[in-house]
């Protein structure tokens, strides 16, 4: 792969071993101003696999508020507006990075954590082949 | 709101002003071992709004690899396996936190950045505007 030369203006770090502690500027560079998913689109209502958004709050985590999708139905909405159980609504999940205060209640010390969140729902055909 | 007392064992921080620099342990606490979304589920193939996953790599970002969903069709797949253009496949997007090396090429100095990623696709009824 390509070796990128280290910038000579980098801050010093004492310990190069893992667990590695780095400096992180929390002044977020944010290209996306709209953080409430309910406002950003109404797909959650118009989807054939509609979902509700639940607010998950944790003061020991950054970001402290995460929205979790929960599919409204087991089946999917058909052309007549009824739930069709031949198909299934399933949550689309994604692993995201969050900062967890460590030690707890510390304002300036965090640990990276990966969590799995449900972002929305999609309509799928049932599993027809079982993978052993 | 509830005020959580500060832990006396917290590391010192020089500057309490924003932009705030904090210490982050990069030894990730990961509850989810499966990071390749293609292995975690085959929803991208079984969905009525199927999608392809594209690998987005950036060595100046942490995580350096992010998977982006791109809907395969403008319409949705109907019961006959054909694309139905009365409905639309749309990407479900989510804002995620990443760490951006700042200054560039520095191994131990980052800035938090919010980016918008497409996680998967869902099938929606099109918006119908009635002209008065």
């Amino acid at each position: 792969g390509i070796t990128i030369p280290r910038n000579p203006g980098c801050p010093n770090s004492e310990d190069k071993n893992f667990p590695r502690t780095v400096m992180v500027n929390l002044n977020i560079h944010n290209r996306n101003t709209n953080t409430n998913p309910k406002r950003s689109s109404d797909y959650y209502n118009r989807s054939t696999s509609p979902w509700n958004l639940h607010r998950n709050e944790d003061p020991e985590r950054y970001p402290s508020v995460i929205w979790e999708a929960k599919c409204r139905h087991l089946g999917c909405i058909n052309a007549d507006g009824n739930v069709d159980y031949h198909m299934n609504s399933v949550p689309i999940q994604q692993e995201i990075l969050v900062l967890r205060r460590e030690p707890p209640h510390c304002p300036n010390s965090f640990r990276l954590e990966k969590i799995l969140v449900s972002v929305g729902c999609t309509c799928v055909t049932p599993i027809v082949h079982h993978v052993a | 709101g509830i005020t959580i007392p500060r832990n006396p064992g917290c590391p010192n921080s020089e500057d309490k002003n924003f932009p705030r620099t904090v210490m982050v342990n990069l030894n990730i606490h990961n509850r989810n071992t499966n990071t390749n979304p293609k292995r975690s589920s085959d929803y991208y193939n079984r969905s009525t709004s199927p999608w392809n996953l594209h690998r987005n790599e950036d060595p100046e970002r942490y995580p350096s690899v992010i998977w982006e969903a791109k809907c395969r069709h403008l319409g949705c797949i109907n019961a006959d396996g054909n694309v139905d253009y009365h409905m639309n496949s749309v990407p479900i997007q989510q804002e995620i936190l990443v760490l951006r090396r700042e200054p560039p090429h520095c191994p131990n100095s980052f800035r938090l950045e919010k980016i918008l990623v497409s996680v998967g696709c869902t099938c929606v009824t099109p918006i119908v505007h009635h002209v008065a």
């Epitope: 087991l74 055909t125 049932p126 599993i127 | 589920s41 929803y43 079984r46």
Partner: nanobody, 118 residues
Framework: EVQLVESGGGLVQAGDSLRLSCVAS???????AAWFRQAPGKGRELILS????????YTADSVKGRFTGSRVNTKNTAYLQMNNLKPEDTAVYYC????????????WGQGTQVTVSS
């Protein structure tokens, strides 16, 4: 823990009928009761799925018009009625249950062998 037990398999002639039963013990069937089969050297495939209301939500093309399913929720039992059996129906037949078959099946039976001779 729910346990599924199949019965009713055996050796039959082509054109005969068989009725398989699946009893859920230690709990109730979930939203979907399903029948899978696995022929020698092949993967396990879904042949029929029954929703809690009793409606059939999936029938594999290979068994359409010959196989049908039912369930009696009060007896925690699902049935697979197989008519006009063919040699290619020879397989181990498994019962499964799912809360959401889009995500996966939660419980599986041990299977019952069905052999159709010509």
């Amino acid at each position: 823990e729910v346990q599924l037990v199949e019965s009713g398999g055996g050796l039959v002639q082509a054109g005969d009928s068989l009725r398989l039963s699946c009893v859920a013990s230690g709990g109730t069937f979930s939203n979907y009761a399903a029948w899978f089969r696995q022929a020698p050297g092949k993967g396990r495939e879904l042949i029929l799925s029954i929703f809690r209301s009793g409606s059939i939500t999936y029938t594999a093309d290979s068994v359409k018009g010959r196989f049908t399913g039912s369930r009696v929720n009060t007896k925690n039992t699902a049935y697979l009625q197989m008519n006009n059996l063919k040699p290619e129906d020879t397989a181990v037949y498994y019962c499964a249950s799912a809360y959401n078959p889009g995500i996966g099946y939660d419980y599986w039976g041990q299977g019952t062998q069905v052999t159709v001779s010509s």
